[in-house]
């Protein structure tokens, strides 16, 4: 099956404080190779998350990502800060025969806006 | 430190059942998908069956696919793999191992024997 | 199914390579255990081509092209002395297997 990577929703809203789900899925695994999640493109782009078993502070795979033909690499991000707002990439990998690991495919993007805290 | 501790085996008699355990300790057992390789005497390594980090999904080699079942107590940190109609073929040291995330093994326990003999 | 040499010889020093060929580099991630004794639990050396994992020696290394894999261990020591199976994952099939080990003497 064809390689996509979707992610369905162009922009999500969550208040300061509270946790937010960004969704990404694939229709194939193959060619095998990691997924990874970065917020910003370019140079300048974070890596926020990585399914490849680091350890990252406040966010969570949202599915079973061990399950041998998981299609879901959903991420949950929680207690939230004016700091994560931006747009998150759900990115997909080749593996390569060194480093680093070849980008082949990127969901559309999620933008994420994050509001002040209800007072 | 991650530690892997295999337990259960022995001696059987063909057609009759073992149930191995596997006890999980130094790392977060819920995390991690599990699979269960064994070694015959004077052989190879053999992977048998994996589990995913939730359990709920397995997966088998053909031939121990209808015969083992590979489970997880994550409560326990414990692995577990039912052997139902042993053969002489099943003698091998078995071992549980720990996944990485693409499904190759880190950490090994260190075996136990199961030997099926009349 | 995985095919490496039966086994391979080294002066202490030496670098030597042991090949592992049979996998498809579009579907498959490598592995390389070693056992130092038959019964004995296996340590892993290598995994995903080419990590190492943090407490085994900078003399081992892992690469994949194509579709063999190749495990380098640059000089090599009497205590390496082992059988050095490949291992496989295949993300078409779900399924791990194994070569059948390449037995390396130090001489």
């Known amino acids: 099956k064809e390689l996509k990577v979707t992610q369905p929703e162009k922009s999500v809203s969550v208040a300061a404080g509270d946790s937010t789900v960004l969704n990404c899925t694939l229709t194939s695994l193959l060619p095998v190779g990691p997924i990874k999640w970065y917020r910003g493109v370019g140079q300048s782009r974070l890596l926020i998350y990585s399914f490849t078993g680091e350890h990252f502070p406040r966010v969570t795979n949202v599915s079973d990502a061990t399950k041998r033909n998981n299609m879901d690499f959903s991420i949950r991000i929680s207690n939230v800060t004016p700091e994560d707002a931006g747009t998150y990439y759900c990115v997909k990998f080749q593996k390569g025969p060194s480093e680093p690991d070849t980008e082949i495919q990127s969901g559309g993007g999620t933008e994420v806006y994050v509001l002040a805290k209800p007072s | 430190d991650v530690q892997l501790v295999d337990s259960g085996g022995g001696v059987v008699r063909p057609g009759e059942s073992l149930r191995l355990s596997c006890a999980a300790s130094g790392f977060t057992f819920s995390s991690y998908a599990m699979s269960w390789v064994r070694q015959a005497p004077g052989k190879g390594l053999e992977w048998l069956a994996g589990?995913?980090?939730?359990?709920?999904?397995?997966y088998y080699i053909d031939s121990v696919k209808g015969r083992f079942t590979i489970s997880r107590d994550n409560s326990k940190n414990s692995l577990y793999l039912q052997m139902n109609s042993l053969t002489a073929e099943d003698t091998a040291v078995y071992y549980c191992?720990?996944?990485?995330?693409?499904?190759?093994?880190?950490?090994w326990g260190l075996g136990t024997l199961v030997t099926v003999s009349s | 199914a995985l095919t490496q040499p039966a086994s391979v010889s080294a002066n202490p020093g030496e670098t030597v390579k042991i090949t592992c060929s049979g996998g498809?580099?579009?579907?498959?991630?490598y592995g390389w255990y070693q056992q130092k004794s038959p019964g004995s639990a296996p340590v892993t050396v290598i995994h995903s081509d080419d990590k190492r994992p943090s407490d085994i020696p900078s003399r081992f290394s892992g690469s994949a092209s194509g579709s063999a894999a190749t495990l380098t261990i640059t000089g090599v020591r009497v205590e390496d002395e082992a059988v050095y199976f490949c291992g496989a994952y295949d993300g078409r099939t779900y399924i791990n297997t194994f070569g059948a080990g390449t037995t390396l003497t130090v001489l």
């Open positions: 191992a720990r996944e990485t995330w693409n499904h190759l093994f880190d950490y």
């Open positions: 498809d580099y579009y579907s498959t991630y």
């Open positions: 589990i995913s980090a939730g359990g709920s999904d397995t």
